[in-house]
């Protein structure tokens, strides 16, 4: 039989085959931010290097205005890290001064919009109380994790203040998917 | 037809195809360190195990005084983690005697070594501020993402000092690769 | 010949191959715990959510009574993220009576179970100390690697602590694996 | 891919303005910083300012403060230098570049020659 | 305020390694990244080297840069008459909050 030597021993044949090649790929990596008014209780969302240096976007998957742009279908593998700075955090002061101990803190979460509905779903969260008793703290927040996207589907990344990312080097904050 | 039904319903033909079981695999873990002199401002390397409990390196990729040699081309998912200890630091120590309060911190790299490029490539950086008030502290840094690399590239995990990583255990501190 | 096409060009056949769609896949997310007692000197193991909102389980990857159970033998990226908060630690209410500094920790620990071994296999850990100054704290411990698994192998996640671990979103605290 | 093409060159008498444009395509305008850079003939480059294109704040070299003023378009992905006041010294190729990765300035304009002559 | 030092000139023969340096006179900016470009009479600057080291696609490898301390450096090896040009460093200035460049290295192939 022509073909057969794809065949596992037990003649299941597994389809569609594809390359492991021609799958949607990115890696994004930081730049300055240009920050803009946004909605109170509404996180940021940063942009980001698609071409330079280690940045890449191939096979269909796009970048564009702050998103990722889902090519096909299927399950992606998606991670972001973002490094933030930052002068000893106010909740440090409030504590010297005796008022109520609320702390500060760094969010980051990656976003899925879809077209057909209405609101954005929060696919991953990484958050961190900052109480600092250093003058300058810096320190990431890493998250990854698969989920099932639909062709269309638009990814990003939202932070709580975008004033306290490092965007001095790629390697510090950098965002990512690939077709598994 | 012989052989159509490997192909998508669209007639598309994906080449070339692979079995994912061939393709280059590592994943090694954390021996006790051997520190050696290292330039100034250039942070020392970490070795490796392996071969034995949970590492393990397949399908030409190769471990080698430090390194992880690429075998082939393409894109690879690149993950470390460093789980860091030590003692209260030294930022606690200088803000109680008043001085200026520049943070210690602890840093984890995975950087890539081409041969035709005489400097270093940082393909990934965590760093965090440490200013610790407990009198121990451990904290585990994770880095992971995706990464065009070319047979022959090397990598390598570097870290701010060797000392303070934690080497009793290998699920605590880890390195490894795999192929898209 | 028919079916040539999918052989790369120097005639070298990859076998099996498959598709990835129908490759063991799953994504678990936090529900609220009901602990349980537990041996002391061992970790609980946290229960998952496996269907509904970003939660799945496909092709043969089967979720039971906390244990995500391996259809296959292979390489397996397996990741889980545990949001922990708290109040003030015991750390500092311990540091500001003057008796010895022991910190709290937090603790992620991703374990492999096989049935033919009488102990449990500690695959990935995730380890942290906690001296928080603030009233309230939270923080995110984050863990992905590669195995190499059996068929039949049990994968579960235990922390130090359950009732510290954030269950309010399902963005906070995942656990997923995915054969490579 | 990300282009930026300028205005054509000027010639000026000593007092009076000029206004260079910089279009910008091949990216998202708003995304990303966009810098001014001048040049005098036979010396080495000299940095004026940026805008943020996103919200229009600016940030100016000291040396131009009060003479300089950095616009944007959004609608046509355009930002605009206008330096008052010229002198003689001014005589010069005005540059935009765009800040990228590392906050370097990856992508430049061709370049505008402003000449301030009596 | 701080300064960027560079040699206005330097020279090498076809084949050769030459190398630029470039001093910061302030170590306030020392903790940041150098980055290096090229320019060819009559045309703008070109992006050539990054984060001290790191060489955007498309640029040779012949090109490299390197940074210790408050002093960075750029080296050609194999030099080749294509070379010829104008390089410079430049720096994030966090008191400028801006580029500061330096003067520029005239480089004869000779």
């Known amino acids: 039989l022509k073909g057969q030597e794809f065949a596992p021993s037990h003649q299941q044949v597994y389809a569609p085959l594809r390359a492991d090649g021609d799958k949607p790929r990115a890696h994004l990596t930081v730049v300055r931010q240009t920050p803009t008014q946004h909605f109170k209780n509404q996180f940021p969302a940063l942009h980001w290097e698609h071409e330079l240096g280690l940045a890449f976007t191939k096979n269909r998957m796009n970048y564009t205005n702050k998103f990722l742009l889902i090519p096909e279908s299927g399950d992606y593998f998606i991670y972001s890290q973002v490094t933030f700075r930052g002068m000893t955090s106010e909740c440090s002061e409030i504590r010297q001064a005796g008022r109520p101990n609320k702390p500060d803190s760094i969010t980051v979460v990656i976003t899925k919009v879809t077209d057909s509905y209405p609101e954005p779903t929060q696919l991953l969260m990484g958050t961190k109380s900052v109480c600092e008793v250093g003058s300058n703290w810096f320190q990431p927040i890493y998250l990854g994790a698969m989920f099932s996207l639909q062709e269309g589907d638009k990814l990003m990344v939202n932070v709580s203040d975008i004033s306290l990312v490092d965007y001095t080097k790629e390697d510090k904050t950098f965002f990512g998917a690939f077709l598994l | 037809l012989k052989g159509q039904e490997f192909a998508p319903s669209h007639q598309q033909v994906y080449a070339p195809l692979r079995a994912d079981g061939d393709k280059p695999r590592a994943h090694l873990t954390v021996v006790r360190q051997t520190p050696t002199q290292h330039f100034k401002n250039q942070f020392p390397a970490l070795h490796w195990e392996h071969e034995l409990g949970l590492a393990f390196t397949k399908n030409r990729m190769n471990y080698t005084n430090k390194f992880l040699l690429i075998p082939e081309s393409g894109d690879y998912f690149i993950y470390s983690q460093v789980t860091f200890r030590g003692m209260t630091s030294e930022c606690s120590e200088i803000r109680q005697a008043g001085r200026p309060n520049k943070p210690d911190s602890i840093t984890v790299v995975i950087t890539k070594v081409t041969d035709s490029y005489p400097e270093p490539t940082q393909l990934l950086m965590g760093t965090k501020s440490v200013c610790e008030v407990g009198s121990n502290w451990f904290q585990p840094i994770y880095l992971g993402a995706m990464f065009s690399l070319q047979e022959g590239d090397k990598l390598m995990v570097n870290v701010s000092d060797i000392s303070l990583v934690d080497y009793t255990k290998e699920d605590k501190t880890f390195f490894g690769a795999f192929l898209l | 010949l028919k079916g040539q096409e999918f052989a790369p060009s120097h005639q070298q056949v990859y076998a099996p191959l498959r598709a990835d769609g129908d490759k063991p896949r799953a994504h678990l997310t936090v529900v609220r715990q009901t602990p349980t007692q537990h041996f002391k000197n061992q970790f609980p193991a946290l229960h998952w959510e496996h269907e509904l909102g970003l939660a799945f389980t496909k092709n043969r990857m089967n979720y039971t009574n906390k244990f995500l159970l391996i259809p296959e033998s292979g390489d397996y990226f397996i990741y889980s993220q545990v949001t922990f908060r708290g109040m003030t630690s015991e750390c500092s209410e311990i540091r500001q009576a003057g008796r010895p500094n022991k910190p709290d920790s937090i603790t992620v620990v991703i374990t492999k179970v096989t049935d033919s071994y009488p102990e449990p296999t500690q695959l990935l850990m995730g380890t942290k100390s906690v001296c928080e100054v603030g009233s309230n704290w939270f923080q995110p411990i984050y863990l992905g690697a590669m195995f190499s698994l059996q068929e039949g192998d049990k994968l579960m996640v235990n922390v130090s602590d359950i009732s510290l671990v954030d269950y309010t979103k399902e963005d906070k605290t995942f656990f997923g694996a995915f054969l490579l | 891919q990300v282009q930026l093409v300028q205005s054509g060159a000027e010639v000026k008498k000593p007092g009076a303005s000029v206004r260079v444009s910089c279009k910008a395509s091949g990216y998202t305008f708003t995304g990303f910083y966009m810098h001014w850079v001048r040049q005098a003939p036979g010396q080495g480059l000299e940095w004026m300012g940026w805008i943020n294109p996103d919200s229009g704040g600016t940030n100016y070299a000291q040396k131009f403060q009060g003479r300089v003023t950095m616009t944007r378009d959004t609608s046509i992905s355009t930002a605009y230098m206008e330096l008052s006041r010229l002198r003689s010294d001014d005589t010069a190729v005005y540059y935009c570049?765009?800040?990228?990765?590392?906050?370097?300035?990856?992508?430049w304009g061709q370049g505008t020659l402003v000449t301030v002559s009596s | 305020q701080s300064v960027l030092t560079q040699p206005p000139s330097a020279s090498g023969t076809p084949g050769q390694r030459v190398t630029i340096s470039c001093s910061e006179s302030?170590?306030?900016?020392?903790?940041?990244?150098v980055n290096w470009y090229q320019q060819f009479p009559g045309t703008a600057p070109k992006f050539l080297i990054y984060s001290n080291n790191k060489r955007p696609s498309g640029v040779p490898d012949r090109f490299s840069g390197s940074k210790s301390g408050t002093s960075a450096s750029l080296a050609i090896s194999g030099l080749q008459s294509e070379d010829e040009a104008d390089y410079y460093c430049?720096?994030?200035?966090?008191?400028?909050?801006?580029?500061?460049f330096g003067g520029g290295t005239k480089l004869t192939v000779l």
């Open positions: 570049a765009r800040e990228g990765i590392a906050v370097a300035l990856t992508y």
């Open positions: 302030n170590s306030d900016i020392g903790t940041n990244a």
């Open positions: 430049a720096t994030w200035d966090d008191n400028l909050n801006g580029p500061l």
